[in-house]
């Protein structure tokens, strides 16, 4: 058993049929010695009496808010949550496996630049009685500070018969140098509590590996005289690290017909302009990627040809 | 340790092209190592991230762009020097700061070159003949060092009398390649910045 926060405790349980469970000692936070009784949750059923109570915890019915009273007055509370371990593996019932980039990916994180700011998100089908708390650090043995905000519900989607909820959190490394060469990864830890079930999820990464620039901005077309060709121009996204001559991007320019089946023409360039043939009803899209370290491409920025 | 004396090439900036070749070569070599050594811990998640140049050179700090010198977090490790003005272009008056930056890059390359050559000598003794260093990568390191045009004492290649542990050597190769790729990215950024200056 360990304390998650004040008066909230997590009991780690080996989860198998007829498991004996764990013995947990609860102590009433009071100077009183006599006449103390204990109840669980809203039940008026008295569990026992005395300043300390030893309880056998073996299933969710044994978790909950234990309250000690004296003469009708509440003295203190202890909330017990369960963390299940089945066949040596901690349960992952609360979050959905996103399976990208690999199986057992519950947390996904992205950074728009090298400032040390990043966003992580996760998915669940649970809509109520759900809380998250996020901690992060650079390295684990001698951790350096990373500050995370509160997790918030960022999107709701319908998937077949199910509703899916996306939560996200923003974190910022306390002292980040955009030019630094990372040798210790960022660690992100998410505590998830659904009713009386506790689970924790972790992710470890280097900022350089989760970079995904915003799409290029101010995408414009300039027709070239007496030609089907156009000059496409764009700019670095505002959120990208500066100076741009140091943090350079490379770009992919794509001409895509109306039909998905039509052949796509693609050009790769380090410049912020390119000359392409603009077909009728086609659209021109541009995306960006770090020029020197191949992490993710940005989403496309698009303009119609006409 | 005496700093090498900078005598940058006049004419067009040759370093950018060589640094791009270097990044390509080390990335290809790393990919090859990851594929060939698939049953060894050779991915970024599996290896320990070591920097053989740590406390010996200060490339990141010495080559910091002027715009980042206002960032306290970039200045916390040493008395940092910055690229201020001038470039590796036609200017014969290379600033002292830039000379420091380029000499630091040169020292990095020299250290990695020695490590890779020593390692290759060991890998050539492996009866499995599983992996060797790409000669192209070694050549590209050499070309960039020549383009930087520093005069520096040659470091003797490390020789070892004991029987090499090939498993450890291959893991060390992965660690070195990962670290060198990261340094090659920094070098490329620096050269791109200098080219634009």
């Amino acid at each position: 058993i360990w304390e998650l926060k004040k008066d909230v405790y997590v009991v780690e349980l080996d989860w198998y049929p007829d498991a004996p469970g764990e013995m947990v000692v609860l102590t009433c936070d009071t100077p009183e010695e006599d006449g103390i009784t204990w109840t669980l949750d809203q039940s008026s059923e008295v569990l026992g009496s005395g300043k300390t109570l030893t309880i056998q915890v073996k299933e969710f019915g044994d978790a909950g808010q234990y309250t000690c009273h004296k003469g009708g007055e509440v003295l203190s509370h202890s909330l017990l949550l369960l963390h299940k371990k089945e066949d040596g593996i901690w349960s992952t019932d609360i979050l959905k496996d996103q399976k990208e980039p690999k199986n057992k990916t519950f947390l996904r994180c992205e950074a728009k630049n090298y400032s040390g700011r990043f966003t992580c998100w996760w998915l669940t089908t649970i809509s109520t009685d759900l809380t998250f708390s996020v901690k992060s650090s650079r390295g684990s043995s001698d951790p350096q500070g990373v500050t995370c905000g509160a997790a918030t519900l960022s999107a709701e989607r319908v998937r077949g018969d199910n509703k899916e909820y996306e939560y996200s959190v923003e974190c910022q490394e306390d002292s980040a140098c955009p030019a630094a060469e990372e040798s210790l990864p960022i660690e992100v830890m998410v505590d998830a509590v659904h009713k009386l079930k506790y689970e924790n999820y972790t992710s470890s990464f280097f900022i350089r590996d989760i970079i995904k620039p915003d799409p290029p901005k101010n995408l414009q077309l300039k027709p070239l005289k007496n030609s089907r060709q156009v000059e496409v121009s764009w700019e670095y996204p505002d959120t990208w690290s500066t100076p741009h001559s140091y943090f350079s991007l490379t770009f992919c320019v794509q001409v895509q017909g109306k039909s998905k089946r039509e052949k796509k023409d693609r050009v790769f360039t380090d410049k912020t302009s390119a000359t392409v043939i603009c077909r009728k009803n086609a659209s021109i899209s541009v995306r960006a990627q770090d020029r020197y370290y191949s992490s993710s491409w940005s989403e496309w920025a698009s303009v119609p040809c006409s | 340790r005496n700093l090498p004396v900078a005598t940058p090439d006049p004419g067009m900036f040759p370093c950018l092209h060589h640094s791009q070749n270097l990044l390509r070569a080390v990335s290809n070599m790393l990919q090859k190592a990851r594929q060939t050594l698939e049953f060894y811990p050779c991915t970024s998640e599996e290896i320990d991230h070591e920097d053989i140049t740590k406390d010996k050179t200060s490339t990141v700090e010495a080559c910091l762009p002027l715009e980042l010198t206002k960032n306290e977090s970039c200045l916390n490790s040493r008395e940092t020097s910055f690229i201020t003005n001038g470039s590796c272009l036609a200017s014969r008056k290379t600033s002292f700061m830039m000379a420091l930056c380029l000499s630091s890059i040169y020292e990095d390359l020299k250290m990695y070159q020695v490590e890779f050559k020593t390692m290759n000598a060991k890998l050539l003794m492996d009866p499995k003949r599983q992996i060797f260093l790409d000669q192209n990568m070694l050549a590209v390191i050499d070309e960039l060092m020549q383009a930087l045009n520093f005069n520096s004492e040659t470091v003797p290649q490390k020789s070892s009398l004991e029987e090499p542990d090939f498993y450890k050597t291959k893991i060390k190769l992965c660690i070195l390649l990962h670290a060198f790729r990261i340094r090659a990215v920094t070098i490329d950024r620096v050269m791109s910045y200098l080219n634009a200056s």
Epitope: G21, T37, E45, V46, L47, G48, S49, I55, Q56, V57, K58, E59, G61, D62 | -
Partner: nanobody
Framework: EVQLVESGGGLVQPGGSLRLSCAAS????????MYWIRQAPGKGLEWVST???????IYGNSVAGRFTISRDNAKNMLYLQMNMLRPEDTALYYC????????RGQGTQVTVSS
């Protein structure tokens, strides 16, 4: 009519063991929290242990680690395994359907003495 009948008491030396049993009838045994309470000579009732319908036990400070409560819902039976007995465990032990012992059996005497 609710009936609770205790058995298994006796005289035992310090450090010894006893197993108390309680046969319940006249109510849906499996739905109830069940309790063992005791009364030492010249003293009031003292709660010893509780068992929830799911079989999870709860223990007072004086017996935790030495006593184990259990139940067999199919047989309507409640048990108390008492190990490492001490002289201060000497008391009349009751099986009860509430912590105050308002619905309890006749009790079974446990004496711990050398």
């Amino acid at each position: 009519e609710v009936q609770l009948v205790e058995s298994g008491g006796g005289l035992v030396q310090p450090g010894g063991s006893l197993r108390l049993s309680c046969a319940a009838s006249g109510f849906t045994f499996s739905s109830y929290y069940m309790y063992w309470i005791r009364q030492a000579p010249g003293k009031g009732l003292e709660w010893v242990s509780t068992i929830k319908p799911n079989g999870s036990g709860i223990y007072g400070n004086s017996v935790a680690g030495r006593f184990t409560i259990s139940r067999d819902n199919a047989k309507n039976m409640l048990y108390l395994q008492m190990n490492m007995l001490r002289p201060e465990d000497t008391a009349l032990y009751y099986c009860a359907r509430d912590v105050r012992g308002t619905v309890r059996g006749q009790g079974t005497q446990v004496t711990v003495s050398s």
